[in-house]
C-alpha cells in the first residue's frame, strides 16, 4: 500500500482539472492513500474542496468521504485517459450541497455511487443521466445510495425535495439497470408516482425512516425483480387492497414494515386478513397498532374483524345530502361575495351615507349631553326632540 500526503501544506486539494497533466498510472494524489493491489484510493476526512485530478488509472474503489466538496460540477471525474475501471465511488459526508448535471460522466464502469449524508439543496435532474435528452445512454449504475441527503429546512429550495430526487432518478430513463436504491432518512412525505415505473430492474429498495403516510398512488406492479422493500419507520397507517395485491404479485419480494403507526379501525380489516395469509412480510408478528388509543400495542396478526370498528358515522345517503348542502351554501356564499364586489361603489356610497347619519346622530347625543350637564337647562331636556 502506498500513501501520499501533502508535504508542503495541509491546505485542501485545489488543483484544476483543466490544467492537470495526464496522471501517471501509479501516482497517488496528495492527502490520499492508495493501494494498487486493492485498486483502492482513500481520500478520507481531508477537508478536500475539489476532487483530486491526479487519480491513478487503476482505481476501482474511490473513497472521498468526510470532505468539504460543496459542489460537484459537470465532469467532476472526467479525465484523459478516463478512469475506466472506477466501479465504486463513495462521496458520503462530504458536505455536498449541489450536484450538477453530468457530474458522473465519463465513468464507464461506475456501478456503485454513495452520496449519503450530504445536504443536497440542489440535485440536477441530469446528475445521473448526464444529458437532457428524453432518452439518454444507459447509466452503468447498479447501486445508488442516497440515504439522508435531505438539506436542512433553511437550505431547501422552493420546490418539493421528493420531486427533485425523483426527477434525477427518472431523467432520460438512464437508470433502467439500477438494482439497488437506498433513500432512507430523507423526510419523504410521499413517493412521486412515476419513479418506480422507470426503475424496472430494482431488486432492493430502501425507503425506511421517512415520513410516508400512504402508498395509495405508488405502483409496485412492474418491479418484478424486487427482492427487498424496506418501509420501516415511516408514518404508514394502513395498506389498501391495491397495494396488497401488487405486493403479493411480486414473485421474490420480502417487505419490511416495522415501526409504522398502524391505525387499527375498520379500514385495517383487509390488511389484517392479508397479513395472516401472506409470506411476503418479514417479522409480521411484530406489527402492532398505534391508534386508536384502545388498540395501542395490539398485535395486528391477533386481531379479528370484531376488533376493527370505526366510530359510528352517518349513513351514506345522509352524508351525500350534507355534502350537497355544503356545496349549495358555498355557492350562495360565493354569489353573495360576488354581488358585494360588483356593487362595491354603491356600497361605499351607502357606507358614507350611514357614516354621515351616524355622525349627525352622535352630534345630537352630544348636544343632549351638554344640556343635561347644565343644571340651568335641565327642564328643557324633557322637551328636547333631537
Amino acid at each position: 500500500t502506498s500513501s501520499a500526503s501533502s508535504s508542503s501544506s495541509s491546505a485542501p486539494f485545489l488543483a484544476s482539472a483543466a490544467s492537470a497533466q495526464p496522471p501517471l498510472p501509479d501516482q497517488c494524489p496528495a492527502l490520499c492513500e492508495c493501494s494498487e493491489a486493492a485498486r483502492t484510493v482513500k481520500c478520507v476526512n481531508r477537508n478536500l474542496t475539489e476532487v483530486p485530478t491526479d487519480l491513478p488509472l487503476y482505481v476501482r474503489n474511490l473513497f472521498l468521504t468526510g470532505n468539504q466538496l460543496a459542489v460537484l460540477p459537470a465532469g467532476a471525474f472526467a479525465r484523459r485517459p478516463p478512469l475506466a475501471e472506477l466501479a465504486a465511488l463513495n462521496l458520503s459526508g462530504s458536505r455536498l450541497d449541489e450536484v450538477r448535471g453530468g457530474a458522473f460522466e465519463h465513468l464507464p464502469s461506475l456501478r456503485q455511487l454513495d452520496l449519503s449524508h450530504n445536504p443536497l439543496a440542489y440535485l440536477s435532474p441530469f446528475a445521473f443521466s448526464g444529458s437532457n435528452a428524453s432518452i439518454s445512454a444507459p447509466s452503468p449504475l447498479v447501486e445508488l445510495i442516497l440515504n439522508h441527503i435531505v438539506p436542512p429546512d433553511d437550505k431547501r429550495q422552493n420546490r418539493s425535495f421528493e420531486g427533485m430526487v425523483a426527477a434525477a432518478l427518472v431523467a432520460g430513463r438512464a437508470l433502467q439497470g439500477l438494482h439497488l436504491l437506498e433513500l432512507a432518512s430523507n423526510h419523504f412525505l410521499y413517493l412521486p408516482r412515476d419513479v418506480l415505473a422507470q426503475l424496472p430492474s430494482l431488486r432492493y429498495l430502501d425507503l425506511s425512516n421517512n415520513s410516508l403516510v400512504s402508498l395509495t398512488y405508488v405502483s409496485f406492479r412492474n418491479l418484478t425483480h424486487l427482492e427487498s422493500l424496506h418501509l420501516e419507520d415511516n408514518a404508514l397507517k394502513v395498506l389498501h387492497n391495491g397495494t396488497l395485491a401488487e405486493l403479493q404479485g411480486l414473485p421474490h419480494v420480502r417487505v419490511f414494515l416495522d415501526n409504522n403507526p398502524w391505525v387499527c379501525d375498520c379500514h385495517m380489516a383487509d390488511m389484517v386478513t392479508w397479513l395472516k395469509q401472506t409470506g411476503v412480510v418479514q417479522g409480521k408478528d411484530r406489527l402492532t397498532c398505534a391508534f386508536p388509543e384502545k388498540m395501542r400495542n395490539r398485535v395486528l396478526l391477533e386481531l379479528n374483524s370484531a376488533d376493527l370498528d370505526c366510530d359510528p358515522i352517518l349513513p351514506p345517503s345522509l352524508q351525500t345530502s350534507y355534502v350537497f348542502l355544503g356545496i349549495v351554501l358555498a355557492l350562495i356564499g360565493a354569489i353573495f361575495l360576488l354581488v358585494l364586489y360588483l356593487n362595491r361603489k354603491g356600497i361605499k356610497k351607502w357606507m358614507h351615507n350611514i357614516r354621515d347619519a351616524c355622525r349627525d346622530h352622535m352630534e345630537g347625543y352630544h348636544y343632549r349631553y351638554e344640556i343635561n350637564a347644565d343644571p340651568r337647562l335641565t327642564n328643557l331636556s324633557s322637551n328636547s326632540d333631537v
Epitope: 493491489a37 486493492a38 474503489n61 466501479a87 445510495i145 439497470g177 437506498e182
Partner: antibody, heavy 122, light 110 residues
Framework: EVQLEESGGGLVKPGGSLRLSCAAS????????VGWVRQACGKGLEWVSI???????YYANWAKGRFTISRDNSKNTLYLQMNSLRAEDTAVYYC????????????????WGRGTLVTVSS | DIQMTQSPSTLSASVGDRVTITCQAS??????LAWYQQKPGKAPKLLIY???TLESGVPSRFSGSGSGTEFTLTISSLQPDDFATYYC????????????FGQGTKVEIK
C-alpha cells in the same frame, strides 16, 4: 502483498462437519464482495456462496441449509461452515474476492487463494 | 434459476489461430458476465468482466463481447501460454441458482 490464504481442509467422514477459513492480508475484507468456489478433481468450477459488504449472503441451491458463510472483520477472515458433508462435497475449496466494493449485487473474482482440499470419505 | 452453457467443451487449435468461445445464459443477464482462465493445479484468473472490460494486466489479444443471453470470448492470435480451460461466470444474480459458472471450455494444442 495482497493475498488470500485458505485453511481448515482435510479428511472428514460423511455426515461430519468442517470449518474453512480464509485469511486476507494487504486488504480489508469487510468492504468487499467475497465468496467460496469449489472444484472437484477434473471437474469445472462450482460457485458455493457469497457475502456482500452489507452482510447479505447468498448460497447455491444445493448448499442451502448445510453451508454457512460468515466474516470476522476484526480478524479480517472469511469462513465457510460445512455441515452434513457428503462424498460429492469432496473438492478443492477456493476463497475469492471481487476488487469492487458492493453493498448487495455482483461479484467477479479477481483475487483467489490457492485453495484447500476437503475430502469426504468413510 | 439462471444456467450458463459454454460451447464447445473442447477446442483444438494451433498457435496463431483466432479462437472463439461462446457462453449462453438461460435468461437475460445484461452485461453481467466474466471470463476466467485456469491452468492445471492453479486458481482461476480473471480475464474480462462486465462482458467486455479487460482486466488490468491481461493481454489485449483477449476480448469479450455480447449482452443479454449470448456472449463471446475471442483470442485474436493464440499464444502457447493460452492453452488452458476457460470459464464464463454470470454476475447478474446469486439468488436461487445452482451454479454461476459455465461448465468450461478446454483449449488444447491441435
Amino acid at each position: 502483498e495482497v493475498q488470500l490464504e485458505e485453511s481448515g481442509g482435510g479428511l472428514v467422514k460423511p455426515g461430519g462437519s468442517l470449518r474453512l477459513s480464509c485469511a486476507a492480508s494487504g486488504i480489508d475484507l469487510s468492504h468487499y464482495v467475497v465468496g467460496w468456489v469449489r472444484q472437484a478433481c477434473g471437474k469445472g468450477l462450482e460457485w458455493v456462496s457469497i457475502i456482500y459488504g452489507s452482510g447479505r449472503t447468498y448460497y447455491a441451491n444445493w448448499a442451502k441449509g448445510r453451508f454457512t458463510i460468515s466474516r470476522d472483520n476484526s480478524k479480517n477472515t472469511l469462513y465457510l461452515q460445512m455441515n452434513s458433508l457428503r462424498a460429492e462435497d469432496t473438492a478443492v475449496y477456493y476463497c475469492a474476492r471481487d476488487a469492487s466494493v458492493s453493498v448487495y449485487y455482483w461479484g467477479y473474482f479477481d483475487l483467489w487463494g490457492r485453495g484447500t482440499l476437503v475430502t469426504v470419505s468413510s | 434459476d439462471i444456467q450458463m452453457t459454454q460451447s464447445p467443451s473442447t477446442l483444438s487449435a494451433s498457435v496463431g489461430d483466432r479462437v472463439t468461445i461462446t457462453c449462453q445464459a438461460s435468461q437475460s443477464i445484461g452485461s453481467e458476465l466474466a471470463w476466467y482462465q485456469q491452468k492445471p493445479g492453479k486458481a482461476p484468473k480473471l480475464l474480462i468482466y462486465r462482458a467486455s472490460t479487460l482486466e488490468s494486466g491481461v493481454p489485449s489479444r483477449f476480448s469479450g463481447s455480447g449482452s443479454g443471453t449470448e456472449f463471446t470470448l475471442t483470442i485474436s492470435s493464440l499464444q502457447p501460454d493460452d492453452f488452458a480451460t476457460y470459464y464464463c461466470q454470470q454476475g447478474y444474480t446469486y439468488s436461487e441458482i445452482d451454479n454461476a459458472f459455465g461448465q468450461g471450455t478446454k483449449v488444447e494444442i491441435k
